[in-house]
C-alpha cells in the first residue's frame, strides 16, 4: 500500500496473507471457514495461509495449508478479465474476534462510497519496502466512465476503480487479492494498476465482487 | 545508478553452446520488481527476444528458440546468463541483455519496457 | 504470434521536420506498446512505453500515441542527433515479446 497508514489492529479480521513458502505472494479475504476469496492471477500449486494477525509472519497466527484453488473459468491471463479464484483450505479455520468471515454484498456500491483497501504490499516504488504491519488506505469508488478515460479498452465490465484524485495512495506489488472494503461489505479485490504505483490519478483497478456473488456461492457448493 | 555488461566468447564453432553472462552492478538483480532479458540483433538486422527470466527463476523464451534455450539467475554473483545449444551461422549477432521494467503491478506485471541495456557483445558462429 | 509492422522501413528528413512513424500490431495489443532509438553501433534506447508514456530524462519532442492495433511515434522538431533508427516493440503476457522491423531516419 503506498501512502497508507497502519491499520487499527484486529480491524481486519478476515484478511489473510498467502505465502510462498514465508514469502508473500498475496493478500486474500476470509469468506468462510473453508474458503478464502484472492484474484486469479495469485494462483500456485499449493498455498500457506495466515490468518489472525496484523503481523507478515507472525508465530502466533493461525497458519493452514490450502492445495485447491478454483480460478473462475472465465479468466483470461491476456485481458485479466475475471480475475477472481477461491482457495479451499485443507482444514477449517477456528474462528475467534482475531479470524471471522467477511460480508459478501448485497448490492455494489455507487461510485463516490468509501472504502478501505488493505495489504502488505510494498510501501514504496519502484524500489519495494515490504512492511511487517497490515496497512491501510481510504479510498473512492471510481466511475467506470471516469476510470475509462485513464485506462480506455484495459477496463473490463466486472473491474471495478477506486482512488482519490490527485493523491499518490493507491495499492501495490503483494497486495494482490486483498479486500476492498465498503460500508463493511467486500466490494473489491486488488487486481491490477500501473507501474510505478501511487501516480496520482491512476485509480486501483479491483475485480467488482458482487458481480461475482452467485459464482462464489456456487463454487464453495460444488466443492463443500 | 544500474549498468549491465555482457561478458563471454567472441567466437564460438558451429554444433557447440553460446554462453554468456550478464552482470549487473548498481542495483539487486533480486530485486521484486524487475524481468531480466536477453535480445540478440544480425548484422544489419533488427531486434529479436530471446528469453527472460524473473526474480523467482520463472523463465519465459522465444518459441522460436525455445528447445535451445536456457536462461539462469545467479543472485550471489548479481548476474544472469543465457545458453543457446547447437549454435549454427544464423546465431551469429550482437547480443544485448536487459532490465525489463513491469509497465503495471498484480494481474499487469507481466508487461515490461526494456529501460536498462548492456552495450551487446559480439558473437560469432565460425569454425 | 503477434506480428508488428512498421512504416516506412526508410525515410529522409531535414532538422526541424515533424517526422511520423507508425507501428500496426496483428491483433489489439491495448497501450502496450514501446518505442525505442538505436545508433549505430550502440544499444536500443527507451524513449516511449505503454504507447505513450515519455521515458524520464527523454526530450519532450517526442511523443507516442495509439491504442489497440495502430500507434504512432512522432518527432515534432528534428534534431541532429535524432538521426538513428526506431523500433516499436509490444510486450503481450504470452511470448514472444516482439520488435518492428525498424525505421531508419536519414537526412535529407
Known amino acids: 500500500i503506498i501512502d497508507g497508514y497502519k491499520c487499527k489492529e484486529g480491524s481486519h479480521p478476515w484478511q489473510v496473507a498467502l505465502l510462498k513458502g514465508n514469502q508473500l505472494h498475496c493478500g486474500g479475504v476470509l469468506v468462510d471457514k473453508y474458503w478464502v476469496l484472492t484474484a486469479a492471477h495469485c494462483k500456485m500449486g499449493q498455498y500457506q495461509v495466515q490468518l489472525g494477525s496484523d503481523k507478515i509472519g507472525d508465530q502466533s497466527a493461525q497458519k493452514i495449508k490450502a492445495t485447491k484453488s478454483f480460478r473462475h473459468p472465465g479468466y483470461s491471463t491476456k485481458t485479466h478479465v475475471n480475475d477472481i479464484m477461491l482457495v479451499r483450505l485443507d482444514e477449517p479455520v477456528k474462528m475467534s474476534s482475531k479470524v471471522e468471515a467477511v460480508q459478501l454484498p448485497e448490492h455494489c456500491e455507487p461510485p463516490g462510497t468509501s472504502c478501505t483497501v488493505s495489504g502488505w504490499g510494498t510501501t514504496t516504488s519502484p524500489d519495494v519496502t515490504f512492511p511487517s504491519d497490515l496497512m491501510c488506505s481510504d479510498v473512492k469508488l471510481i466511475s467506470s466512465r471516469e476510470c475509462k478515460k485513464v485506462y480506455k479498452d484495459l477496463l473490463g465490465k466486472t473491474m471495478l476503480c477506486a482512488g482519490i484524485p490527485d493523491s499518490k495512495t493507491n495499492t501495490c506489488n503483494g497486495d494482490s487479492g486483498g479486500p476492498l472494503v465498503c460500508n463493511d461489505t467486500l466490494q473489491g479485490l486488488v487486481s491490477w494498476g500501473t507501474y510505478p504505483c501511487g501516480q496520482p490519478n491512476d485509480p486501483g483497478v479491483y475485480t467488482q465482487v458482487c458481480k461475482y456473488k452467485r459464482w462464489v456461492m456456487e463454487t464453495m457448493k460444488t466443492h463443500r | 545508478q544500474l549498468q549491465l555488461q555482457e561478458s563471454g566468447p567472441g567466437l564460438v564453432k558451429p554444433s557447440e553452446t553460446l554462453s554468456l553472462t550478464c552482470t549487473v552492478s548498481?542495483?539487486?538483480?533480486?530485486?521484486?520488481?524487475?524481468?531480466w532479458v536477453w535480445i540478440r540483433q544480425p548484422p544489419g538486422k533488427g531486434l529479436e527476444w530471446i528469453g527472460s527470466?524473473?526474480?523467482?527463476?520463472?523463465?519465459y523464451y522465444n518459441p522460436s528458440l525455445k528447445s535451445r534455450v536456457t536462461i539462469s539467475v545467479d543472485t550471489s554473483k548479481n548476474q544472469f546468463s543465457l545458453k543457446l545449444s547447437s549454435v549454427t551461422a544464423a546465431d551469429t549477432a550482437v547480443y544485448y541483455c536487459?532490465?525489463?521494467?513491469?509497465?503495471?503491478?498484480?494481474?499487469?506485471?507481466?508487461?515490461?519496457?526494456?529501460?536498462?541495456w548492456g552495450q551487446g557483445t559480439t558473437v560469432t558462429v565460425s569454425s | 504470434d503477434i506480428q508488428m509492422t512498421q512504416s516506412p522501413s526508410s525515410l529522409s528528413a531535414s532538422v526541424g521536420d515533424r517526422v511520423t512513424i507508425t507501428c500496426r500490431a496483428s491483433?489489439?495489443?491495448?497501450?502496450?506498446l514501446n518505442w525505442y532509438q538505436q545508433k549505430p553501433g550502440k544499444a536500443p534506447k527507451l524513449l516511449i512505453y505503454?504507447?505513450?508514456s515519455l521515458q524520464s530524462g527523454v526530450p519532450s519532442r517526442f511523443s507516442g500515441s495509439g491504442s489497440g492495433t495502430d500507434f504512432t511515434l512522432t518527432i515534432s522538431s528534428l534534431q541532429p542527433e535524432d538521426f538513428a533508427t526506431y523500433y516499436c516493440?509490444?510486450?503481450?503476457?504470452?511470448?514472444?515479446?516482439?520488435f518492428g522491423g525498424g525505421t531508419k531516419v536519414e537526412i535529407k
Open positions: 536487459a532490465r525489463g521494467r513491469p509497465l503495471g503491478y498484480g494481474a499487469r506485471h507481466y508487461y515490461y519496457a526494456m529501460d536498462v
Open positions: 548498481g542495483g539487486s538483480i533480486s530485486s521484486l520488481d524487475y524481468y
Open positions: 527470466i524473473d526474480y523467482s527463476g520463472d523463465t
Open positions: 491483433q489489439s495489443i491495448s497501450s502496450y
Open positions: 505503454s504507447a505513450s
Open positions: 516493440q509490444q510486450s503481450p503476457y504470452f511470448p514472444p515479446l516482439t
